[in-house]
């Protein structure tokens, strides 16, 4: 029986050109975490394996950094990075737990000025 729950940072926003940490945490289970896969929609971003360590997909190597912990750091954000991210915890003996994070990348100037200056 799967008793664990995944806590995530939920819906987050960040500025274009900046960086963001994606974090998930598995709790309420004694299951052993063997691997955590990070996905963006239908793309595998990175894998952290208990034995092998980190593998970052080559196409994301320039902008994705492992950690902190089992989390993932996205750098040099673009508007195209907006979307859903998933942390997939492979555990034994429970099986697989999945957490979801929604990231919105904002144009920094638009975000700032849009909030402060309302056109009547």
């Amino acid at each position: 029986m799967m008793t664990g729950t995944i806590e995530t940072t939920g819906n987050i926003s960040a500025e274009k050109g900046g960086s963001i940490i994606l974090q998930c945490h598995l709790s309420s289970t004694t299951a052993q975490v063997t691997q955590v896969n990070w996905e963006q929609q239908d793309q595998l971003l990175a894998i952290c394996n208990a034995d092998l360590g980190w593998h970052i997909s080559p196409s994301f190597k320039d902008r994705v950094a492992p950690g902190p912990g089992l989390g993932l750091t996205l750098q040099s954000l673009t508007v195209n990075d907006t979307g859903e991210y998933f942390c997939i915890y492979h555990t034994y003996p429970d099986g697989t737990y999945t957490g979801r994070i929604f990231l919105e990348v904002l144009e920094s100037s638009v975000a700032e000025h849009g909030a402060r200056f309302q056109i009547p």
Partner: antibody, heavy 118, light 107 residues
Framework: EVQLLESGGGLVQPGGSLRLSCAAS????????MSWVRQAPGKGLEWVAG????????GYADSVKGRFTISRDNSKNTLYLQMNSLRAEDTAVYYC???????????WGQGTLVTVSS | DIQMTQSPSSLSASVGDRVTITCRAS??????LNWYQQKPGKAPKLLIY???SLQSGVPSRFSGSGSGTDFTLTISSLQPEDFATYYC?????????FGGGTKVEIK
């Protein structure tokens, strides 16, 4: 250099048993998921079974479930496939394979031929 | 189980040709799709993993694309040593499953 060397294949009668072994070297065997993949003569590839690094997690193809058992001895750097109740359709070359992150197969053995015939 | 359908099952091409092989999964497999090359009497060789990542040592004329259910292996300029059989394989869930293979022959 990564090496996977299968042994134990041969001719066996229907209903018989065989145990295949795969001796691994050149990498930290205990850290990797390992699998057996087979190929019948003139046919495509079929995944047979897989075992995660700590032996806790195992998986089998429906066609061999209940008849084949995958196991490993990390102290001996060896992967095994115990095959019971063999059938003619199990005739194939059996490959031992390394599966990093349980996602892709980056190294294969040279294969060992199992022939099930009376 | 997830079914993998490859097309075409065989094709004839000339050296220098651009060759495209497609693979379709019976359900979404994200980018958990790998491509292998096999020559007669030899073990398969990994070309592309996770849909688009080129395995170390594999020539850059090989490329992979796609996500979800539809994937493509492209050989930009076919070389004599590329005549072989190519297989796709999903690792989204067990049992792992392979496509039926595409045999690339000399025209």
């Amino acid at each position: 250099e990564v090496q996977l060397l299968e042994s134990g294949g041969g001719l066996v009668q229907p209903g018989g048993s065989l145990r295949l072994s795969c001796a691994a070297s050149g990498f930290t065997f205990s850290s990797y998921t390992m699998s057996w993949v087979r190929q019948a003569p003139g046919k495509g590839l079929e995944w047979v079974a897989g075992i995660w690094s700590d032996s806790g997690n195992k998986g089998y193809a429906d066609s061999v479930k209940g008849r084949f058992t995958i196991s490993r001895d990390n102290s001996k750097n060896t992967l095994y496939l115990q095959m019971n109740s063999l059938r003619a359709e199990d005739t194939a070359v059996y490959y031992c394979a390394r599966v990093p992150y349980s996602v892709w197969i980056d190294y294969w053995g040279q294969g060992t031929l199992v022939t099930v015939s009376s | 189980d997830i079914q993998m359908t490859q097309s075409p099952s065989s094709l004839s091409a000339s050296v220098g040709d651009r060759v495209t092989i497609t693979c379709r999964a019976s359900q979404s497999i994200s980018s958990y799709l790998n491509w292998y090359q096999q020559k007669p009497g030899k073990a398969p060789k990994l070309l592309i993993y996770a849909a688009s990542s080129l395995q170390s040592g594999v020539p850059s004329r090989f490329s992979g694309s796609g996500s979800g259910t539809d994937f493509t292996l492209t050989i930009s300029s076919l070389q004599p040593e590329d005549f072989a059989t190519y297989y796709c394989q999903q690792s989204y869930s067990t049992p792992l499953t392979f496509g039926g293979g595409t045999k690339v022959e000399i025209k």
